[in-house]
Amino acid sequence: QRFAQAQQQLPLESLGWDVAELQLNHTGPQQDPRLYWQGGPALGRSFLHGPELDKGQLRIHRDGIYMVHIQVTLAICSSTTASRHHPTTLAVGICSPASRSISLLRLSFHQGCTIASQRLTPLARGDTLCTNLTGTLLPSRNTDETFFGVQWVRP
Amino acid sequence: QRFAQAQQQLPLESLGWDVAELQLNHTGPQQDPRLYWQGGPALGRSFLHGPELDKGQLRIHRDGIYMVHIQVTLAICSSTTASRHHPTTLAVGICSPASRSISLLRLSFHQGCTIASQRLTPLARGDTLCTNLTGTLLPSRNTDETFFGVQWVRP
Amino acid sequence: QRFAQAQQQLPLESLGWDVAELQLNHTGPQQDPRLYWQGGPALGRSFLHGPELDKGQLRIHRDGIYMVHIQVTLAICSSTTASRHHPTTLAVGICSPASRSISLLRLSFHQGCTIASQRLTPLARGDTLCTNLTGTLLPSRNTDETFFGVQWVRP
């Protein structure tokens, strides 16, 4: 059970409640498949409590098991568009440090225009998560269609 | 880490463990795109611990960041059905109070018969979440195919 | 809020932080639609903290409400393949004890090659979860494409 606030003097961040929800800022230049994210109350309903953004990529500040989730919708897309521009693929992975580089979650769009998934994965302080969108279609920047987040679950 | 039960005298609800998982009750009349939900152990595996239902819509009782998730499957659907009657779209949003009205999560079915997604979002006590299904296909009422839930994650 | 580590002497498992993330080991023989899972740090990023594997199926060790999530990608799949071999369906359910047998989550692939979803559901100590993949297509064993996990959320 979560600790009663009355008994809790420490700031939330010290308790391992790291959480972030990001919205798309922009895509990278042509040879860079990464999506660049942004977050903060001034932008709408995105936020970072613990993790930080490093040049649009999410950096983890606390070791633990995290729930990572993502939804990406392709812009001006129909099932015909999606199939014609196949393959469009999204991969979420640890991109730095290089020694820990690994793909965590991968999905192809096939004849759909949206992918959404989630998974539990161990992450360490300093891990940077990158989201790579390969293909020639642009992601929607609508905040209810494209988002990316993490939630600390346990040590 | 969650607080050891031995040291915890307060009821769970006072600790911010609000959670709900709902099953579809019915669709609205023709001009009302909202889905109407129901929950409770008598109905199967749905439940409400904290949030409440207000005329089939989910009302939040505790401020915080929530994980919102949903799956909707269309009834008697094949990829042909889904594509022929495009666009069928699901949107989850805050529908009241009107001052906080916003779309939180939106997906189109395109050539698929199921959408499923999840996101983290701040919600406040009194926020009512509505799930709007636009289009002319009916959602499945099977409890393993269509469901909607929230989980309080942190203040 | 989660209890500060400094004040927490009990092992994590005693606090109800059960969590597991599994990767596909193998499919069953022809008449057995179940997927067989494996987990542990030696295998990569999969793990079991609390729940256990029983002949490749996930057994719950603590009563509570759990978030169950899954992603399955079909091997060597295109939208044409997927539609031609329709229906391919994935169902996650309690398969034992028999008295509690129920389908919790069900998705069809239609013209897609990946399904991903999640839901909250009450589970009891001793419940074994089975994931049934019906159809003639094989699931990918790539750890970023096919995975299955549970997270204890509250009592």
Epitope: - | L24, Q30, T73, A75, I76, T81, R84, H85, T136, L137, L138, P139, S140, R141, N142, E145 | -
Partner: antibody
Framework: QVQLVQSGAEVKKPGASVKVSCKVS????????LHWVRQAPGKGLEWMGV????????DYNQKFKGRVTMTEDTSTDTAYMELSSLRSEDTAVYYC?????????????WGQGTLVTVSA | DIVLTQSPASLAVSPGQRATITCRAS??????????LHWYQQKPGQPPKLLIY???NLESGVPARFSGSGSGTDFTLTINPVEAEDTANYYC?????????FGGGTKVEIK
């Protein structure tokens, strides 16, 4: 309000073809599929097929495949059903019908019917 | 194709009484939590009129004395109380799959 108005009665010889029209009003023609149902004198109702007015896609009852052709003309909001190689047992009232709001095949809206008599 | 069998073939009922018509499907017409079975009334020289859709939903403008029930393969249309204007043929129809089919009809007469 939704209206479906069909063409007038026809008398045809065996082996001939008949083409029945169904002009719709009160809604956007391409929004909803149109079905054709027939009823022989004193008999029950028999579904013949459906045309998607959105893209012209058709599904026919196996019984009529090869003899029935359903088409649409979006410029005049009109659907057509043509039945060829007529025989005496094709004598019936032919109805066009439209589904309601939902895309499932039950029919709140019907044309008035067109009597087709097949007689030598 | 799914075969729908209606019974009785004909029925004579006194005004104010209850009329019950059954429709049995050769296989289940229920799916996704709905029963895709519908009821129509047809008077001589007129097209059919939708009364009930999805087994139990009353079509707009239809009097509340008409009701439907059932699931799976067995369905019932009830008229209670019957009125003189209810003299007509009644048909069930499924839309569970293509082709949709109709029952053979039940002729209701008022005594």
């Amino acid at each position: 309000q939704v209206q479906l108005v069909q063409s007038g009665a026809e008398v045809k010889k065996p082996g001939a073809s008949v083409k029945v029209s169904c002009k719709v009003s009160g809604y956007t023609f391409t929004d909803s599929a149109l079905h054709w149902v027939r009823q022989a004198p004193g008999k029950g109702l028999e579904w013949m097929g459906v045309i998607s007015t959105y893209d012209g896609d058709t599904d026919y009852n196996q019984k009529f495949k090869g003899r029935v052709t359903m088409t649409e003309d979006t410029s005049t909001d009109t659907a057509y059903m043509e039945l060829s190689s007529l025989r005496s047992e094709d004598t019936a009232v032919y109805y066009c019908a439209r589904r309601g709001y939902y895309d499932y095949d039950w029919f709140p809206y019907w044309g008035q019917g067109t009597l087709v008599t097949v007689s030598a | 194709d799914i075969v729908l069998t209606q019974s009785p073939a004909s029925l004579a009922v006194s005004p104010g009484q209850r009329a019950t018509i059954t429709c049995r499907a050769s296989k289940s017409v229920s799916a996704s939590g709905y029963s895709f079975l519908h009821w129509y009334q047809q008077k001589p020289g007129q097209p059919p009129k939708l009364l009930i859709y999805l087994a139990s939903n009353l079509e707009s403008g239809v009097p509340a004395r008409f009701s439907g029930s059932g699931s799976g393969t067995d369905f019932t249309l009830t008229i209670n109380p019957v009125e003189a204007e209810d003299t007509a043929n009644y048909y069930c129809q499924h839309s569970r799959e293509l082709p949709p089919t109709f029952g053979g009809g039940t002729k209701v007469e008022i005594k």
